[in-house]
Interface confidence: low
Amino acid sequence: EEELQVIQPDKSVSVAAGESAILHCTVTSLIPVGPIQWFRGAGPARELIYNQKEGHFPRVTTVSESTKRENMDFSISISNITPADAGTYYCVKFRKGSPDTEFKSGAGTELSVRAKPSAPVVSGPAARATPQHTVSFTCESHGFSPRDITLKWFKNGNELSDFQTNVDPVGESVSYSIHSTAKVVLTREDVHSQVICEVAHVTLQGDPLRGTANLSETIRVPPTLEVTQQPVRAENQVNVTCQVRKFYPQRLQLTWLENGNVSRTETASTVTENKDGTYNWMSWLLVNVSAHRDDVKLTCQVEHDGQPAVSKSHDLKVSAHPKEQGSNTAAENTGSNER
């Protein structure tokens, strides 16, 4: 009679994490008598998965009634597969004896586990940056298998090309992680912008996972200042306004200086929001010209989001100020930027 063969028809089986894996094995003869055992891996370090004769294997069930005398099908089902179950499984025939001895092994079935990547987590720089600067964003996703994965970066739907991606570990593993760093150049219009990391994997069936970061948490748009003199409100009084435009975030403190001396300090509160997400604010100062004998240098000094103060000055020519009410020829705007 022809010698018994152990047939494992599937060279490989791919299963999604959480599903059951069926590993097929049949023998071609009932002789010699002896049990079947399933192992993961080969050699002395192989791991026993199932023993037909004895033992408790709660995740393993036989597909057919392997206890029947004439049974030649020793296929098994392993439930609740995880990435840790990946490997090559061997169906091995033993010859009955004391002890049983290994008679013949099947060629092996490689079990690969398809595990979904975790939701990508995008993180930006620790400190805010201003427009024209390049900032780095990182994206991480873990626990996927197989290793083949595609990661793409977008800013407001436009694909980014300046990024570096690594998949770890380099060698074989039960599951993998991906780490990518993208460089993004900030613009003044980026308060409402989003950076998106998109991960595509075979387990996601064409529906990629996305992680996002809002550039509002990263960007600082410094204000522009404009100091202007308004029409005279009353005799000897000049109204000077400081327009603080296009700043983000809102945290801003303004100080008025008259000839270098602090006149008033206030914090931006009732701001107006621009379409691009930046803010505008206006502060005014009423100057009593008659209280000054000499020209007055008015300075609007702004400290934005804890950054060094920026300022804009305006010179009031007191000597040229006529005393008639309603006159607006009293001052010249010689604004200059100072830090």
């Epitope: 083949d148 994965i149 595609t150 990661l151 793409k152 694909e159 090309s161 300046d162 990024f163 570096q164 991606t165 690594n166 998949v167 380099v170 990518s180 595509a200 994997h201 075979v202 064409g206 529906d207 990629p208």
Partner: antibody, heavy 117, light 108 residues
């Protein structure tokens, strides 16, 4: 930036053949490189890719076991393990737009492989 | 298995005319599609990526559109230099890195 294939020649069926793609003007550690072939009078057929910064490879399902892609710091090799007459084609190497963005903005001129008895 | 179907396989149009080539994916690939132009004896040349973004130096007469599974390429104001074979390519991960069968454009 440019790429050039070499190693194409007439071979007999079953004789392994290695094609080499030499890159210049960019670093292979930053970009994926794919191999694409085109049989005479036929369309383009993607074979596989080796990614930048690692030796990770991926193959078209039909190409697994028939081709092997490997690389050095400046070259990417394609080995046809056991050529058949159906492997007669012009073989192109192509640079991915970025690592992981696998459309191709730089192509080599191609190298012709003829498999015949 | 994933595939890309290009139609028609050949199209003829006069100088100054317009042709539309269609590329259909067997499953959704978002906007991960590129178009190439290939002339005899030359390697392909990238025309469009991300379904609709023109590659550097490519004429605006070439217009890609669509998403998910349907991707048309429109070539308007045809010139004799546009005579070539055009291929679409999906790059939605290596398992779907596939070229369409190609469309030959003949300019009269």
């Amino acid at each position: 930036q440019s790429m050039e294939e070499s190693g194409g020649r007439l071979v007999t069926p079953g004789t392994p053949l290695t094609l080499t793609c030499t890159a210049s003007g960019f670093s292979l550690s930053n970009y994926g490189v794919s191999w694409v072939r085109q049989a005479p009078g036929k369309g383009l057929e993607w074979i596989g890719i080796i990614y930048g910064g690692s030796d990770i490879t991926a193959y078209a399902s039909w190409a697994k076991g028939r081709f092997t892609i490997s690389k050095t710091s400046t070259t990417v090799d394609l080995t046809i393990t056991s050529p058949t007459t159906e492997d007669t084609a012009t073989y192109f190497c192509a640079k991915s737009y970025t690592n992981g963005m696998d459309y191709y903005n730089i192509w080599g001129p191609g190298t012709l492989v003829t498999v015949s008895l | 298995a994933f595939d890309l179907t290009q139609t028609p396989s050949s199209v003829e149009a006069p100088v100054g005319g317009t042709v539309i080539i269609k590329c259909q994916a067997s499953q959704s690939i978002s906007s991960y599609l590129a178009w190439y132009q290939q002339k005899p004896g030359q390697p392909p040349k990238l025309l469009i990526y991300s379904a609709s973004t023109l590659a550097s130096g490519v004429s605006s007469r070439f217009k890609g559109s669509g998403s998910e599974t349907q991707f048309p390429l429109t070539i308007s104001d045809l010139e004799s230099a546009d005579a070539a074979t055009y291929y679409c390519q999906s790059y939605y991960g290596s398992r779907s890195n596939v070229f369409g069968g190609g469309t030959e454009v003949v300019v009269k």
